[in-house]
């Protein structure tokens, strides 16, 4: 039959070449001569020429040594034709198996792999993997198939087995204890990829293991004991700074340190917080501290990290004594600020009030005073007992120097110390109203026509304060009730000037009286220009004329 | 001589709790990771649990997960295994074990722990 | 079920060798060289004979080997006394959890 079984030929022949491989034989040669031919791949086509076949006899030849990882099977078509050029057969398909030889050397992907494992892990737990290839075949044959293997691990600390490789997949596990980054940070592992499945060809590369940090060491003070001096009352002052070594990966949170005041800081006085590059633990005042009630402070702080421990680890603690030194302290007025009422117009040499400082210091030390700030200059201080006492008129109604009835005063206190130290108190005066001011009409100029005049209504107002104000009272004097009429309207905050009488134009002189609800008398002059009109007016020419 | 003993075996009730310790000696014990293992009556090895050397990995079989806390005190030279919620099933000599290079030694002697009503 | 697989008895007269087999899959006893051998006396703890495949901790009599290949471990007793008669269980360092594979044992009987 003009058929032919797959033809299997090994890579890496040595020849001789051409070589024989097999006869490609048409049964029609029996009645006329038969002329052979192949095509395809391999032998017309690229790459041309790697087989052919003897065109009288049929024998399929090999032209030379084949590469089964460039190509591992060729498609051929055997070709039978007459004399005459007449094909006489189909096509033959002609499988050429090339059949593979351990010719390549298994290659690692990199030459340096890099993995990592937590310092301190189980046996058991996997790394990393690494990979190597081999082209030859690892399906037929056993030349492709690679084991792995670790040929050396450096250091040899604890000891040389401390991690394992998978032989069929590569990946890298720990199989013993011990592994402590704070005694070897890194590994580096040569292994070894074996074809023939650990029978054959090697090569070897790199994998370096990095040890990551677990935070199994605690943060340690070195020293354990301090001493600080502070100065009483400073805020904010650094009492002492605090120094630890731990052994984890600097500036990770296993590293990085958390103060804690255990003991010893009843009143809140102290915080404590980490440096953010030194990892000290800087201790500071968050109140002030006072020498007169305790002088010496003892505190515990404990340090822990960031992160947790991962195993139970004993904590350091730090003893600091703490002293606080003495320092000359300001009096302190007692109160702050001391209001105080007091009536307006008190006559000068009056006592006002006594405002007297107390000192923090336990010495008896002598307190003088005096006045800082007094504006209307209406106060003396004595020196020695802190009595005020009136040396102007207190006036109320001063809208100079008395806002909302309250007149301000600083004083000051100085002790004899060495160096003197001042405080300063606030002494707010209250001052009560006296019926000191007469009710005032506004506006003290009108202008009224002499023909149906218009009544003039004036505003009433008094400085003082209820009940020294309305309702007010409205006297016409000095004859001008003869022309004149004022009456003061329910309310008694306004006062109702009429013209009786005729007068010519001219301007007039209205004398008129108001009392307020305390009888507080006030004579004002209004100053009428009287023009020669009907009802409403606001200007008219005319000379002036007393009246 | 390096040395595992166990303590705290015993009877309990299904339900019941139970804390084996295992002290070790004669080894740096906070260098090993240590494990338990046990074996009911007539039966094979069962590894049970797992802890490294610092005490931060642990492992459980999933037979025991969420009941059974593994713990050591590197300070006593102490493994614990606190055992909760025991069923008839735990019922088992235990042994404590070092872990390491793919094998296990020494070994403690073993405590029976009897959970039955 | 046991992971790894043991005859469960084997037997043999004073004197002679006996072979104790402990098969695995490619994940474990194929993957690593960390097969070990027990032997547990009715009773007592189990006591390691074999590490690492072959290797032998010190005390152990030399009549106790191992080899492997492939999947399957190997625990020969050549010279076989009396005091062999026990339960030997095989164990295997396997990738992923449970990391220990135990065989159901194998009772070696002292004809």
């Known amino acids: 039959d003009w058929v032919v079984a797959p033809i299997s030929v090994p890579e890496n022949g040595k020849g001789p070449f051409p070589q024989r491989l097999n006869q490609l034989k048409s049964n029609k040669d029996r009645d006329t001569k038969i002329f052979y031919s192949i095509t395809g791949p391999g032998a017309d086509s690229p790459p041309e020429g790697v087989f052919a076949v003897e065109k009288e006899t049929g024998w399929l030849l090999l032209n030379k040594p084949l590469d089964r990882e460039e190509i591992a099977k060729y498609e051929l078509f055997g070709h039978a034709v007459s004399e005459n050029g007449a094909s006489v057969e189909d096509p033959m398909n002609i499988s050429i198996i090339v059949t593979d030889q351990n010719d390549h050397k298994p290659k690692f992907t990199q030459d340096t792999f890099r993995g990592s494992v937590l310092e301190g892990v189980l046996p058991g737990t996997s790394v990393m993997q690494v990979t190597a290839t081999d082209e030859d075949d690892a399906i037929y044959t056993y030349n492709g198939v690679v084991a792995y293997s670790i040929h050396s691990q450096e250091p040899k600390d604890p000891h040389d087995l401390m991690f394992t490789i998978h032989r069929s997949t590569g990946t890298i596990s720990v199989i013993s204890s011990g592994l402590d980054r704070e005694k070897v940070p890194e590994y580096t592992l040569t292994i070894q990829a074996t074809d023939m499945d650990g029978d054959g060809s090697t090569t070897t590369a790199v994998a370096v293991v990095e040890i990551l940090d677990a935070n199994d060491n605690a943060p340690m003070f070195d020293p354990q004991k301090y001493e600080a001096h502070v100065p009483e009352n400073a805020v904010g002052h650094e009492v002492q700074r605090l120094t630890v070594t731990d052994l984890d990966a600097p500036n990770s949170p296993a590293w990085r340190a958390t103060y804690l005041i255990m003991g010893g800081d009843d009143g809140d006085h102290f915080t404590i917080t980490t440096h953010p590059e030194s990892n000290q633990g800087i201790l500071t005042t968050r109140k002030g501290l006072d020498f007169e009630a305790k002088n010496q402070h003892t505190l515990y702080v404990e340090v822990t990290n960031e992160a947790p421990f991962v195993l139970k680890l004993p904590t350091s603690t730090a003893t600091i004594v703490v002293h606080v030194e003495d320092v000359n302290e300001a009096p302190v007025f007692v109160p702050p600020s001391k209001v105080v009422e007091v009536q307006e117009g008190i006559p000068t040499g009056e006592p006002v009030c006594v405002y007297t400082a107390e000192d923090p210091d336990k010495e008896n030390q002598k307190i003088s005073y005096r006045i800082l700030r007094d504006p209307a200059g209406w106060l003396a201080m004595d020196p020695d007992s802190g009595q005020v006492t009136a040396v102007g008129t207190l006036d109320r109604e001063d809208e100079q120097f008395v806002r909302n009835n309250i007149y301000e005063v600083m004083v000051l206190a100085m002790d004899n110390g060495s160096p003197p130290t001042t405080g300063t108190g606030t002494l707010l005066l209250t001052l009560i109203d006296v019926n000191d001011h007469g009710p005032v009409p506004e506006p003290r100029q009108i202008t009224i026509c002499n023909q149906s005049p218009v009544r003039q209504v004036l505003n009433i107002t008094d400085k003082d304060l209820s009940p020294h104000t309305s309702p007010f009272q409205a006297q016409l004097t000095d004859d001008s009730d003869i022309y004149w009429t004022a009456e003061v309207n329910e309310e008694g905050d306004t006062v109702v000037l009429s013209l009786k009488k005729f007068l010519k134009q001219d301007t007039y002189d209205v004398h008129l009286s108001l009392s307020d609800h305390g009888n507080k008398e006030q004579l004002t002059v209004i100053r009428a220009t009287v023009c020669d009109c009907h009802g409403h007016v606001e200007t008219c020419p005319g000379p002036w004329k007393g009246g | 001589e390096v040395q595992l003993l166990e303590s705290g075996g015993g009877l309990v009730q299904p339900g019941g709790s139970l804390r084996l310790s295992c002290a070790a000696s004669g080894f740096t014990f906070s260098s090993y990771a240590m494990s338990w293992v046990r074996q009911a009556p007539g039966k094979g090895l069962e590894w049970v649990s797992a802890?490294?050397?610092?005490?931060?990995?642990?492992y459980y079989a999933d037979s025991v997960k969420g009941r059974f806390t593994i713990s050591r005190d590197n300070s006593k030279n102490t493994l614990y295994l606190q055992m909760n919620s025991l069923r008839a099933e735990d019922t088992a000599v235990y042994y404590c074990?070092?872990?390491?290079?793919?094998?296990?030694?020494?070994w403690g002697q073993g405590k029976m722990v009897t959970v039955s009503s | 079920q046991s992971a790894l697989t043991q005859p469960a008895s084997v037997s043999g007269s004073p004197g002679q060798s006996i072979t104790i087999s402990c098969t695995g899959t490619?994940?474990?006893?194929?993957?690593?060289?960390?097969v070990s051998w027990y032997q547990q006396h009715p009773g007592k703890a189990p006591k390691l004979i074999l590490s690492e495949v072959n290797k032998r901790p010190s005390g152990v009599s030399n009549r106790f080997s191992g080899s492997k290949s492939g999947n399957t471990a190997s625990l020969s007793i050549s010279g076989l006394q009396a005091e062999d008669e026990a339960d030997y269980y095989c164990s295997s360092f396997t990738s992923g959890l449970p990391w220990v594979l135990f065989g159901g044992g194998t009772k070696l009987t002292v004809l």
């Open positions: 490619s994940n474990d006893v194929g993957a690593y060289n960390y």
């Open positions: 074990a070092s872990w390491g290079t793919g094998t296990l030694w020494p």
């Open positions: 802890i490294s050397g610092s005490g931060g990995s642990t």
